[in-house]
Amino acid sequence: LADPLDHRDAGDLWVPGESESFEDAHVEHSISRSLLEGEIPFPPTS
C-alpha cells in the first residue's frame, strides 16, 4: 500500500523560528519504517 503520509510531500516546511515539526513526520523517519518489513510499531496508515 502506498503511504499517504510519505514525508517527501512535506517539502521544506522547516524554517528558523517555525515551531511545527514537518507535520509530525517522525513516523516516516522512524526505526520501524526504516525496516520496511516484519513487525513494525508504525505500520503505514491507510
Epitope: S21, E23, D24, V27, H29, S32, L35, F42
Partner: antibody, heavy 114, light 112 residues
Framework: EVQLVETGGSLVQPGGSLKLTCATS????????LHWIRRSPEKQLEWVAQ??????????YYAESVKGRFIVSRDDSKTTIYLQMNNLKEEDTAIYYC?????WGQGVMVTVSS | DVVLTQAPLSVSVTPGESASISCRSS???????????LYWYLQKPGMSPHLLIY???NLASGIPDRFSGSGSETDFTLKISEVEPEDVGVYYC?????????FGAGTKLELK
C-alpha cells in the same frame, strides 16, 4: 534485532563534561531521526535533543534547558549518535535514553553532584 | 511550550476492570494533514518507555487491542479495556509536533 545501547554515564561534578554514546544496530540507520530523552529522579520525562538525517542536513534541535551546553551529533558510518554534555548542572541528573520514539535504549544514568 | 496535563496522577484498578487516563493539551495537536500528534507510552518498573499508541489512535505493533486511544484536537484518552497485571507502570502522553517536544507528568497504574 533492533538495538540501541547507551554508554558513558557516570557521576560528575557541577560544571563538568560528559559524552554519551548510543550505538545502534539492526536497522537501516541513515534516514532515521533520533533523539535523546531523559527521565528525572522525579520520574518526569523530558525531551533533550533531536538529530535528523543527512537528507535533512543533520538538523539539530534542543530543549531550552540544554541549549548552548549540549551538542547532539551522529556518525552514520558507525550507526551511532552522541550527546556531548558541557557545563553540567545538578538538574541534569537523570536517566538518558536514546530513542527513535518507537524503539528505546535501556538508558544510562548521569548524576551531577558535588 | 505545549503543556500536557494528565489525570489522574495515579489509579488503582482491579484486574479485569477497565481504566481510562486523560491527557489535555494546551494547544491543538491536529496538523493541516489531519494527523493528531499525540502519543502514549508505558514505562514499566525498571524498564525503558515503550510505545503503545501513536498519532492519537493508532495501535503500535505488538500492543494488545485492550489498549485504545481516542480524542479531539486537545483532549485525549487512553483506555485499557481489561487491565492485566503486566499493565502496571507509569503511562505518559507526549506530543511531537511543536518544539520543544513535551510529555505529561505521568499516570501511575497500580493493581488493587
Amino acid at each position: 534485532e533492533v538495538q540501541l545501547v547507551e554508554t558513558g554515564g557516570s557521576l560528575v561534578q557541577p560544571g563538568g563534561s560528559l559524552k554519551l554514546t548510543c550505538a545502534t544496530s539492526g536497522f537501516p540507520f541513515s534516514n532515521v531521526w533520533l533523539h535523546w530523552i531523559r527521565r528525572s529522579p522525579e520520574k518526569q520525562l523530558e525531551w533533550v535533543a533531536q538529530i535528523k538525517a543527512r537528507s535533512d542536513n543533520y538538523a539539530t534541535y534542543y530543549a531550552e534547558s540544554v541549549k548552548g551546553r549540549f551538542i547532539v551529533s551522529r556518525d552514520d558510518s558507525k550507526t551511532t549518535i552522541y550527546l556531548q554534555m558541557n557545563n553540567l548542572k545538578e538538574e541534569d541528573t537523570a536517566i538518558y535514553y536514546c530513542t527513535g520514539l518507537d524503539y528505546w535504549g535501556q538508558g544510562v544514568m548521569v548524576t551531577v553532584s558535588s | 511550550d505545549v503543556v500536557l496535563t494528565q489525570a489522574p496522577l495515579s489509579v488503582s484498578v482491579t484486574p479485569g476492570e477497565s481504566a481510562s487516563i486523560s491527557c489535555r493539551s494546551s494547544r491543538s495537536l491536529l496538523t493541516s494533514k489531519g494527523i493528531t500528534s499525540l502519543y502514549w507510552y508505558l514505562q514499566k518498573p525498571g524498564m525503558s518507555p515503550h510505545l503503545l499508541i501513536y498519532r492519537m489512535s493508532n495501535l503500535a505493533s505488538g500492543i494488545p487491542d485492550r489498549f485504545s486511544g481516542s480524542g479531539s484536537e486537545t483532549d485525549f484518552t487512553l483506555k485499557i479495556s481489561e487491565v492485566e497485571p503486566e499493565d502496571v507502570g507509569v503511562y505518559y502522553c507526549a506530543q511531537f509536533l511543536v518544539y520543544p517536544y513535551t510529555f505529561g507528568a505521568g499516570t501511575k497504574l497500580e493493581l488493587k
